[in-house]
Interface confidence: low
């Protein structure tokens, strides 16, 4: 039974050019994570494997940063960038936890911190 | 049907080269890694390597690095083993199989192709 | 590396009878996987994480352990189950054990 929860930054909004970081934090579970996958829609951004450490995606490598722990830092954004973010989450025994991150960037210097949620 | 179908095998001499292919089908190629490995005659089975195919990481097993190089092509959800110099010792059928998302098993097995090294 | 050793290398058993393969890590893993090889076909995959069935396997099969001792159990052989199994693990690459070859006694 998956009794886990996956906390995450929940919406968010960045300025042009800034950086953001992304995070997902798996609680209320005692499941090994073997591995975490950073996705954007159907793109993979990063892997991070419990064996093999972090894998950044060639076509991203100049513009993401692994980490802090298994968070995924965004540089140099543009209002490309804006979109849904999804942290997934295969775990031992429980199986596939997945969260979502909403990023907007914004052209002015007025960007605010959406307020964090939960996901089931 | 989830399948992988290989081809490629076939007898080389000691020194040449020789590529693998395992063409797959029956699911999303780009969101799971595939591996390659090979079984000399009448012994047990060893890990060459594997690639996950929508960014093409690749991790190897660190004794073949420098002769044997995985690749993969999206466009025709097709994965690659590029064999160079190779021994007598290469001898073997070689398997490609998909790993199961999170849990690095091989759920998915290739019908194997056996590559005969051999002057 | 871990080295993954499988017991005994070949089991002689009788049709109907109980068998057990043992596999052992040279130090704690969480699980590992076991397949069955029939000559001259592809592994299969039989148990994964330690103790979950892959799809279409029998119930007479189970997988059970922890730590460094992990067993794959045969509750009574049937004709089609004499065959060679490989217990497998990932640490920074995967690892099989030497195999275990089921005959009939």
């Known amino acids: 039974m998956m009794t886990g929860t996956i906390e995450t930054t929940g919406n968010i909004s960045a300025e042009k050019g800034g950086s953001i970081i992304l995070q997902c934090h798996l609680s209320s579970t005692t499941a090994q994570v073997t591995q975490v996958n950073w996705e954007q829609q159907d793109q993979l951004l990063a892997i991070c494997n419990a064996d093999l450490g972090w894998h950044i995606s060639p076509s991203f490598k100049d513009r993401v940063a692994p980490g802090p722990g298994l968070g995924l830092t965004l540089q140099s954004l543009t209002v490309n960038d804006t979109g849904e973010y999804f942290c997934i989450y295969h775990t031992y025994p429980d199986g596939t936890y997945t969260g979502r991150i909403f990023l907007e960037v914004l052209e002015s210097s007025v960007a605010e911190h959406g307020a964090r949620f939960q996901i089931p | 049907e989830v399948q992988l179908v290989q081809s490629g095998g076939g007898l080389v001499k000691p020194g040449g080269s020789l590529r693998l292919s395992c063409a797959a089908s029956?699911?999303?190629?780009?969101?799971?890694?595939i591996g390659w490995v090979r079984q000399t005659p009448g012994k047990g089975l060893e890990w060459v390597g594997d690639?996950?195919?929508?960014?093409?990481?690749?991790n190897s097993n660190e004794k073949f690095k420098g002769r044997f190089t995985i690749s993969a092509d999206k466009s025709k959800n097709t994965a690659y083993l590029q064999m160079n110099s190779l021994r007598a010792e290469d001898t073997a059928v070689y398997y490609c199989?998909?790993?199961?998302?999170?849990?690095?098993?091989?759920?998915?097995w290739g019908q194997g192709t056996l590559v005969t090294v051999s002057s | 590396d871990i080295v993954l050793t499988q017991s005994p290398a070949t089991l002689s058993a009788s049709l109907g009878e109980r068998a057990t393969l043992s596999c052992s890590a040279s130090?704690?893993?969480?699980?590992i996987h076991w397949y069955q090889q029939k000559p001259g076909q592809a592994p299969k995959l039989l148990i994964y994480?330690?103790?979950n069935l892959a799809s279409g396997v029998p119930s007479r099969f189970s997988g059970s352990g922890s730590g460094t001792d992990f067993t794959l159990t045969i509750s009574s052989l049937e004709a089609e189950d004499f065959a060679t199994y490989y217990c497998?693990?990932?640490?920074?690459?995967?690892?099989f054990g030497g195999g275990t070859k089921l005959e009939i006694k």
């Open positions: 199989a998909r790993l199961g998302r999170g849990y690095w098993y091989f759920d998915v």
């Open positions: 029956g699911y999303t190629f780009t969101n799971y890694w």
């Open positions: 690639i996950y195919p929508g960014s093409s990481f690749t």
């Open positions: 130090s704690s893993v969480s699980y």
């Open positions: 994480t330690t103790s």
């Open positions: 497998q693990l990932f640490r920074s690459g995967s690892a």
